[in-house]
Interface confidence: medium
């Protein structure tokens, strides 16, 4: 039977407001609202917490019965939808011990694990996996790319009691490995032997100058020489123009700097590798994965452009249950969500096309009207001129 420590799907209307607590650490934290957004797969099931104010910090958390993950697997899972086409903002969660004062949660509140997507401009599009180990926040050494489109995505972190981990996006593995290898929790197992140094006669040169090679006697030639084809102009006046000097040209016989040919170095020993020894500072920690106490899940974020929706939170000890839960929530509505978005996009495109067409027709009608007015004006002018001509007496007409 899986242990479900925390599950939140926001299926009871405003009920969430009694389970989630706003931090009062700052007076101007952004407000979360319950919404399924502008497009969705299922209007009710896809309701989640949506950030609603631009350029704000958000600090909201929910508590649950405290538990320890010692000796068992920990799975943290939730969905994130950046329907605002996010440019800078967090989409991650923090797991805190139950000692957290939820009304005072803020960016420096000590957490156990931080996990989830983070986007900021073109430079940051990553999934954070940060563990607090002995009071220090330790970041993963790998770059895990997050999704940056407008659709809902499922993020899963699995931490196992054998000190291995797995990160999944949309129920597909994107990263896995060992905690010890992929984070710098512990000092390195091996260090360079401080007592070892490269022997003085160690030769790392693969090639050397051939000692038998010597520069040919006719090698050294000037780089530039007077142009042998140049002639002094006939009108050159040495008194007036000074002594005539032919222009210089590149010497075709110039060979540049002579270098002896290279041969294999008979004394070459290869690159010296500093020998390593076991690091006396290193001692394995089989319980890196373990925390005594989890009691609060928090959203502690900054967003430039609001609109992100968080939903389908799950903390459990059962990987299979989490996968199943993901498929029953995100999995069931993702296709319909895309369908609705595509339909909206198509409607928008048609609307814009229609507006363009209408505008062009109006412009053409205006142009036509202008042309007709112009034609009428020209006809009026001609009629006017004819009338004036008819009014002029005969003899005066000849004089005109």
């Amino acid at each position: 039977e899986p242990a479900v420590y925390f599950k939140e799907q926001f299926l009871d209307g405003d009920g969430w407001t009694s389970r989630w607590i706003e931090s009062k650490h700052k007076s101007d934290f952004g407000k979360f609202v319950l919404s399924s957004g502008k497009f969705y797969g299922d209007e009710e099931k896809d309701k989640g917490l949506q950030t609603s104010q631009d350029a704000r910090f958000y600090a909201l958390s929910a508590s649950f019965e405290p538990f320890s993950n010692k000796g068992q697997t920990l799975v943290v899972q939730f969905t994130v939808k950046h329907e605002q086409n996010i440019d800078c903002g967090g989409g991650y969660v923090k797991l805190f011990p139950n000692s957290l004062d939820q009304t005072d949660m803020h960016g420096d509140s000590e957490y156990n694990i931080m996990f989830g997507p983070d986007i900021c401009g073109p430079g940051t599009k990553k999934v954070h996996v940060i563990f607090n180990y002995k009071g220090k926040n330790v970041l993963i050494n790998k770059d895990i790319r997050c999704k940056d489109d407008e659709f809902t995505h499922l993020y899963t972190l699995i931490v196992r009691p054998d000190n291995t981990y797995e990160v999944k996006i949309d129920n597909s593995q994107v990263e896995s490995g060992s905690l010890e290898d992929d984070w710098d929790f512990l000092p390195p197992k091996k260090i360079k032997d401080p007592d070892a140094s490269k022997p003085e006669d160690w030769d790392e040169r693969a090639k050397i100058d051939d000692p038998t090679d010597s520069k040919p006697e006719d090698w050294d030639k000037p780089e530039h020489i007077p142009d042998p084809d140049a002639k002094k102009p006939e009108d050159w006046d040495e008194e007036m123009d000074g002594e005539w000097e032919p222009p210089v040209i590149q010497n075709p016989e110039y060979k540049g700097e002579w270098k002896p040919r290279q041969i294999d170095n008979p004394d070459y020993k290869g690159t010296w590798i500093h020998p390593e020894i076991d690091n006396p500072e290193y001692s394995p920690d089989p319980s890196i994965y373990a925390y005594d106490n989890f009691g609060v899940l928090g959203l502690d974020l900054w967003q430039v452009k609001s609109g992100t929706i968080f939903d389908n939170f799950l903390i459990t000890n059962d990987e299979a249950y989490a996968e199943e839960f993901g498929n029953e929530t995100w999995g069931v509505t993702k296709a319909a969500e895309k369908q609705m978005k595509d339909k909206q996009d198509e409607e928008q495109r048609l609307k814009e096309e229609e507006e363009d067409k209408k505008r062009k027709e109006e412009e053409e009608a205006e142009d036509k009207e202008d042309d007709e007015d112009k034609d009428e004006d020209e006809e009026d002018e001609e009629d006017k001129e004819e009338d004036e001509e008819e009014d002029v007496p005969g003899q005066a007409k000849d004089e005109l």
Epitope: G107, D108, G121, N137, W302, V304
Partner: nanobody, 116 residues
Framework: QVQLQESGGGLVQPGGSLRLSCTAS?????FGWYRQAPGKQREFVAN???????RYSDSVKGRFTISRDNAKNTVYLQMNILKPEDTAVYYC?????????????WGQGTQVTVSS
């Protein structure tokens, strides 16, 4: 600690232009301009990242241009074809990010009034 200083606000006729400046001290991940009209929520106008990518709100697209002088650590907002609805206090924002931590800093605001 990042200090921000805005300037360039004022009274301008509809259709006119203004250029706002914001000078910062410190290392910035993103600069943004926001505005707040009387009785309304503060709203996003434009922002620019260190990498150079830029974003505008739909209401100012094509009229406003954000730019940055890295040597002076200054960000500008060139506002053209101003409309009465652009009247607001304009705030400069600087975002400093470090390993999942965010700190944002705000200027004191500069008033822009568009009126004939």
């Amino acid at each position: 600690q990042v200090q921000l200083q805005e300037s360039g606000g004022g009274l301008v006729q509809p259709g006119g232009s203004l250029r706002l400046s914001c000078t910062a001290s410190g290392s910035i991940a993103a600069f943004g301009w926001y505005r707040q009209a009387p009785g309304k929520q503060r709203e996003f106008v434009a922002n620019m990242y260190v990498g150079g990518s830029i974003r505008y709100s739909d209401s100012v697209k094509g009229r406003f241009t954000i730019s940055r002088d890295n040597a002076k650590n200054t960000v500008y907002l060139q506002m053209n074809i101003l409309k009465p609805e652009d009247t607001a206090v304009y705030y400069c924002n600087a975002l400093v990010r470090f390993e999942g931590r965010n700190d944002d800093y705000w200027g004191q605001g500069t008033q822009v009034t568009v009126s004939s």
